[in-house]
């Protein structure tokens, strides 16, 4: 089970997808910044159907979506965005 604030000295994503997922089908998004043993940024998406997918951070759609979500105040996000806590 993936944990929102889990930290490890390795990458979490084995495979990444760039296939678009509409916001309405996303439950939450976790952003894992580069570092802590993983050389790349990772984005993990929890979907409404309970499945989980790693999304390519370079995918245009996720970049646009993250920008839209950043513009909204955290209290009104329909899709919570979590970032890994770096100790």
């Amino acid at each position: 089970v993936l944990e929102v604030y889990y930290t490890s000295l390795r990458c979490r994503c084995v495979q990444e997808s760039s296939v678009f997922i509409p916001r309405r089908f996303i439950d939450r998004i976790q952003i894992l910044p580069r570092g802590n043993g993983c050389p790349r940024k990772e984005i993990i998406v929890w979907k409404k159907n309970k499945s989980i997918v790693c999304v390519d951070p370079q995918a245009e759609w996720i970049q646009r979506m993250m920008e839209v979500l950043r513009k909204r105040s955290s209290s009104t996000l329909p899709v919570p965005v979590f970032k890994r806590k770096i100790p």
């Epitope: 296939v19 509409p22 916001r23 309405r24 996303i26 759609w61 979506m65 329909p78």
Partner: antibody
């Protein structure tokens, strides 16, 4: 011109099964999420299920989970809804709808004319 | 799940009247709202998406507004062809339709 044509509706007994089909034309079918929406006689609209581009991702309303299966065949430009363990409350006109997306937002821009499913003994 | 409460459920009006229909969401839907018109025996027709963007080919007498949890559809001057049932749809989290507003001739 975008066209969606549903078929497969009919009268079925409670507990029975039915498979609805939706034939799509006038657009690149594989480029769109698709959905089924239903409307009980004289009632409002109710989203039933959605499917992503290649059929690998599906979503259902709680009341049909485990009973209904949405699928698609991109080679045939067709969308399907397999309905099992049907109940009286599933009686409705079932619409096939195209889900149009821009930045993950606006949706359901094109609809078929619907097919009537009646569950009764 | 997000609930949508649409009001009124029915409305009598005359040609030329200004009419407003409201949809209230149980939580913030961030303007991710669509309005549909439906006539008996027909499929729903999209009028407005993203709260206030008019669908191509829809007359400018239709307009939408709102934010947060409250949204409105306004018909500035009713025409005979506007008598129908109107539904709102939130697409912020899965989908939920409003119960519908039947617009009848007074």
């Amino acid at each position: 011109e975008v066209q969606l044509v549903e078929s497969g509706g009919g009268l079925v007994q409670p507990g029975g099964s039915l498979r609805l089909s939706c034939a799509a034309s006038g657009f690149t079918f594989s480029d769109y999420y698709m959905a089924w929406v239903r409307q009980a006689p004289g009632k409002g609209l109710e989203w039933v299920a959605s499917i992503n581009y290649d059929g690998g991702d599906t979503y259902y309303r709680d009341s049909v989970k485990g009973r209904f299966t949405i699928s698609r065949d991109n080679a045939k430009n067709s969308l399907y809804l397999q309905m099992n363990s049907l109940r009286a409350e599933d009686t409705a006109v079932y619409y096939c709808a195209r889900e149009e997306d821009y930045d993950g937002s606006y949706v359901m821009d094109a609809w078929g004319q619907g097919t009537l499913v009646t569950v009764s003994s | 799940d997000i609930q949508m409460t649409q009001s009124p459920s029915s409305l009598s009006a005359s040609v030329g009247d200004r009419v407003t229909i409201t949809c209230k969401a149980s939580q913030n839907i961030n303007k991710e709202l669509t309005w549909y018109q439906q006539k008996p025996g027909k499929a729903p027709k999209r009028l407005i998406y993203n709260t206030n963007i008019l669908q191509t080919g829809i007359p400018s007498r239709f307009s939408g507004s709102g934010s947060g949890t409250e949204y409105t559809l306004t018909i500035s001057s009713l025409q005979p062809e506007d008598f129908a049932t109107y539904f709102c749809l939130q697409q912020s989290s899965l989908y939920t339709f409003g119960q519908g507003t039947k617009l009848e001739i007074k």
